[in-house]
């Protein structure tokens, strides 16, 4: 068996010889050199060598425990003759013995730490740590003790933990902010001969709010013109605070004084200055000097320092208002006036008032900004500000007039002010109700009495928008003996009813019903609208089939030549009659102009001209051009002079050539499917300045039936199928 103890070896051996480690020995060794010792494992043959005869082990180099504390090797004993092991291979350990060859090393060369100023004694600052590579399990080589080399009396260090604490009361950042503390770590428990290391700890005192703001002066004075608009900065004040950061933030406020409602103070966050601004419009004439008490305070207060006194300070601010020449001031920011639309020119609507706010009280003159009243509808008395109309108003054209009035100092025209005037035009019942649309209807020849053939609706441009109260009735001259009646439905509509059984389109193909529409407003307004009723042949369902008298529709006996001859005669006759009328200029018949009192009815008049040429009236051009309404006192529900076009076309402008104008009308009559087949005079208000000899005869206007294209009748649907069939096959070329 092997015979040895555990081997120990001191580190860092400095002798000149190899360091003896120990001896391997087997009890089989008789000392005759028959056994051979072999070493293998950690460092064998290099760090450790063995005498193969004796088994003595030596270390060839200086060893460092901190590098490797234990070496594990294997030993063998072999019979030299046979080469066989005499012992089983065995593992053994060489343990390196520690010596104090390492000083403590801090984890950081330099530590940085902060602690609030004014902290209590013993306040934790930072913990430093040093480590020692020596064996902590053997002796005191690795037992570290901390001590302070620099930084007293401000700080202390706990010897065993390395915790640095404050050691002095009331350390004031405002006096000294930075401290450099040197800490030593020493092994061997700090005893003599121990190794040591040091570190630097840079400690910064952080700020606490232990200082109030302070104004450097007790009084400030600023000047501002009275014209300064709200928000204008007047001046800056600054309180100083020894603290930093949010502890040095200052809030400024006006706490007292005669102008605390006239001024504001705001804090400039960048500079911590108080900016005094204008809050309300100043008036030199009312007050020239303001004295304010401004306070500066810290918004972030630490209650534990309140014993030091209030964390605020105040100063007096004197503000002097400088006089400025001001423009006139109106008594109101805007004026709302009302005027009835029937107001005469020069009617006073109301007035505006402005005065110079300066002490001088310069006189003021008024004017209307013509850019806001281009049509010069209003005027103003330059002296007293009275607004009056200079033109007639119409609410239905413009309900609100928004104009601007200017007030100017007479002595200093550069000083002027403007004010808006909102003038509401109040409604007067000056518009008559009228038909909502053009009414043209038909009645069947076989209609029964009291049959509804058309419902009428009316509109009125006047107020109220919420509703009107219209009434409908036949015009007086048509009421007696009329073939139709009007039924007022009392709901702003009316119905046209038949008054008899049966109508004959050969006797009368068209009736004109003058319907009077009135409102029940004040003053009552009315107009007369005409409803055209055609007598038509209808099927048994009441669907219209034909609305022309057949005898007039089919000119079967007339050739083209005969028609031309007739037309020529008519033209000559018309020229003669019109010339005769132009020469006479006076008519013995009843006047066309109605009496003034009847103009209010606005009755649209139609002259009965049917039946032939012998009763054609020669119209005085002066009368025709007269713009006033007129009425012929005759039956109203008969054939018109010119049957109504479905839509009224606009009249020609004054500079349009009258021939073009009439030609345009002729073309319309030529292509009008409702144009009467008999001769009728189509009158137009505009007759130009030249001759009126041209005939407007409907017979002349169509030279032959071939001029008419009846193709459109087939597009009119089933009611007009019969008409389309009748006219569709006509060929005027065969008409000889």
């Amino acid at each position: 068996s092997w015979m040895w103890n555990q081997f120990f070896l001191l580190e860092e051996y400095t002798g000149s010889d190899y360091q003896y480690v120990g001896k391997l020995h087997s009890d089989q060794d008789r000392g005759d050199g028959s056994l051979k010792y072999i070493l293998s494992g950690d460092g064998a043959g290099d760090l450790f060598i063995i005498n193969e005869n004796t088994g003595d082990i030596q270390a060839t180099k200086r060893l460092d425990r901190e590098e490797k504390p234990v070496y594990i090797l294997r030993a063998q004993a072999i019979n030299r003759r046979t080469g066989r092991p005499v012992e089983p291979e065995s593992e053994f350990i060489i343990k390196i013995h520690d010596i104090n060859d390492n000083e403590p090393i801090f984890t950081k060369d330099v530590y940085t730490a902060t602690v609030p100023e004014m902290a209590d004694v013993g306040t934790f600052v930072v913990q430093v740590t040093a480590t020692d590579a020596d064996d902590p399990t053997y002796g005191n080589s690795a037992k570290v003790v901390y001590s302070i080399l620099q930084g007293q009396p401000y700080f202390s260090v706990e010897s065993e933990t390395g915790i640095i604490k404050t050691a002095l009361l009331n350390m004031d950042r405002e006096n000294r902010e930075q401290y450099q503390v040197v800490i030593q770590a020493k092994d061997m428990g700090g005893q003599m001969g121990g190794l040591s290391g040091t570190t630097t700890v840079n400690i910064t005192l952080t700020d606490v709010n232990d200082n109030p703001p302070r104004f450097p002066q007790s009084t400030y004075q600023f000047k501002t013109p009275e014209s300064s608009p709200p928000g204008t900065p007047i001046g800056r004040i600054k309180a100083s605070d020894a603290d930093v950061g949010e502890n040095a933030e200052i809030e400024y406020s006006i706490t007292d004084g005669e102008g605390h409602d006239m001024f504001d103070v705001i804090t400039d966050q960048e500079t911590q200055e108080g900016i005094i601004t204008v809050k309300k419009l100043l008036d030199f004439e009312k007050k020239r000097v303001y004295t304010l008490k401004v306070e500066a305070s810290n918004p972030h207060i630490e209650p534990r320092f309140l014993y030091l006194g209030p964390f605020k300070d105040s100063a007096t601010v004197r503000i002097v208002v400088d006089d400025v020449d001001e423009p006139p001031v109106f008594s109101k920011p805007a004026y709302i006036l009302q005027i009835r639309e029937d107001a005469q020119i020069n009617t006073t609507i109301g007035s505006v008032a402005a005065q110079d706010p300066d002490a001088a009280r310069n006189p003021v003159k008024y004017s209307v900004d013509r850019h806001t009243d281009m049509d010069r509808i209003f005027n103003i008395d330059s002296g007293n500000g009275s607004i009056f109309t200079s033109k007639l108003l119409d609410r239905e054209t413009l309900l609100w007039h928004n104009i601007t009035v200017i007030a100017t100092e007479i002595n200093n025209p550069k000083q002027s002010s403007r004010v808006p005037l909102y003038i509401k035009v109040l409604d007067v019942n000056d518009n008559a109700p009228e038909f909502a649309e053009f009414y043209e209807t038909f009645v069947c020849e076989k209609a029964k009495a009291d049959q509804l053939i058309q419902t009428l609706h009316a509109v009125d441009k006047d107020d109220p928008y919420s509703g009107h109260q219209f009434s409908f009735s036949l015009a007086p001259e048509a009421a007696s003996g009329s073939n139709f009646t009007i039924q007022d439905n009392k709901d702003n509509t009316a119905g046209i009813l038949t008054r008899k059984n049966g109508y004959n389109r050969h006797e009368m193909s068209t009736y004109l019903l003058p319907v009077v529409i009135s409102d029940n407003d004040y003053p009552v307004q009315s107009s007369t609208g005409t409803v055209t009723v055609r007598v038509c042949a209808c099927d048994h369902h009441g669907n219209m089939q034909s609305c022309h008298a057949e005898a007039l529709i089919h000119p079967t006996g007339l050739s083209t030549g005969a028609l031309v001859a007739i037309l020529l005669c008519i033209v000559i006759l018309l020229v003669t009659v019109v010339l005769f009328a132009a020469l006479r200029r006076q008519r013995k018949k009843e006047p066309l102009i109605i009496s003034k009192e009847d103009i209010r009815d606005n009755i649209v008049s139609y002259n009965d001209e049917g039946g032939g040429e012998e009763d054609t009236q020669a119209f005085d051009i002066g009368t025709l051009r007269n713009p006033k309404p007129w009425r012929q006192q005759s039956r109203r529900d008969m054939v018109p002079e010119a049957l109504f076009l479905p839509r009224r076309t606009p009249t020609a402008r004054d500079n349009t050539d009258v021939r073009d104008f009439i030609s345009q009308r002729l073309r319309k009559m030529n292509t009008d499917p409702t144009a009467p087949p008999y001769d009728s005079l189509a009158t137009y208000a505009y007759e130009g300045t030249g001759s009126v000899a041209d005939s407007l005869s409907s017979l002349e206007s169509v030279t032959t039936d071939g001029d008419q294209d009846y193709g459109y009748l087939s597009d009119w649907g089933p009611r007009f199928k019969k008409l389309a069939d009748m006219y569709g096959g006509m060929d005027s070329d065969k008409d000889s």
Epitope: S466, Y522, E597, D601
Partner: antibody, heavy 116, light 107 residues
Framework: QVQLLESGGGLVQPGGSLRLSCAAS????????MSWVRQAPGKGLEWVSV????????YYADSVKGRFTISRDNSKNTLYLQMNSLRAEDTAVYYC?????????WGQGTLVTVSS | DIQMTQSPSSLSASVGDRVTITCRAS??????LNWYQQKPGKAPKLLIY???TLQSGVPSRFSGSGSGTDFTLTISSLQPEDFATYYC?????????FGQGTKVEIK
């Protein structure tokens, strides 16, 4: 149904004032012109005043012009007649009536007596 | 002002009679004439407006005609409830004026 109800009549001394009211119901008050018509005891009817639907225009008989003021409150459906500087000849039953030209509905009337 | 004159100022008639009351204007008023009926202690009631248009709810025995200056109210067959005073009124021009009234009494 349409109803008009006058109130405010009574005995007043010459030179005094009175305010008549007419409460309307059963129709869209704001769409109609409204009138006051009076009838002296044992006498015929006399038109007094009219106000348009919006209240924008008012008109008076010459006999009351400058003394009487017609007004209306469309939100309350009420017509008013403020009568100042009353005279003995103003003694009458005062009717409020709907319409500006023909009066299709009338109130029952309120008696105004001007006497010392 | 336009004067309105009614005739007769009073008349006596029996139930079933045809009664005619006329109203004349001092100038032409076109068709702007109304007829009212008033019973003692009651408010007037509109019968006819615009000379000939019957107010809704008014019996068809009442009819009106005329234009210009002469107008007529006709009761085709007098009924017991028709005994009252009848007024005409023009609304052609301001001020609106009433006739002096026609009292229809039982014969």
């Amino acid at each position: 149904q349409v109803q008009l109800l006058e109130s405010g009549g009574g005995l007043v001394q010459p030179g005094g004032s009175l305010r008549l009211s007419c409460a309307a119901s059963g129709f869209t008050f704001s769409s109609y012109a409204m009138s006051w018509v009076r009838q002296a005891p044992g006498k015929g009817l006399e038109w007094v005043s009219v106000i348009r639907s919006s209240g924008s225009s008012t008109y008076y008989a010459d006999s009351v012009k400058g003394r009487f003021t017609i007004s209306r409150d469309n939100s309350k459906n009420t017509l008013y007649l403020q009568m100042n500087s009353l005279r003995a000849e103003d003694t009458a039953v005062y009717y409020c009536a709907r319409g500006g030209g023909y009066f299709d509905y009338w109130g029952q009337g309120t008696l105004v007596t001007v006497s010392s | 002002d336009i004067q309105m004159t009614q005739s007769p100022s009073s008349l006596s008639a029996s139930v079933g009679d045809r009664v005619t009351i006329t109203c004349r204007a001092s100038q032409s008023i076109s068709l702007w004439l109304n007829w009212y009926q008033q019973k003692p202690g009651k408010a007037p009631k509109l019968l006819i407006y615009a000379a000939s248009t019957l107010q809704s709810g008014v019996p068809s025995r009442f009819s009106g005609s005329g234009s210009g200056t002469d107008f007529t109210l006709t009761i085709s067959s007098l009924q017991p409830e028709d005994f009252a005073t009848y007024y005409c009124q023009q609304y052609y021009t301001s001020p609106y004026t009433f006739g002096q009234g026609t009292k229809v009494e039982i014969k």
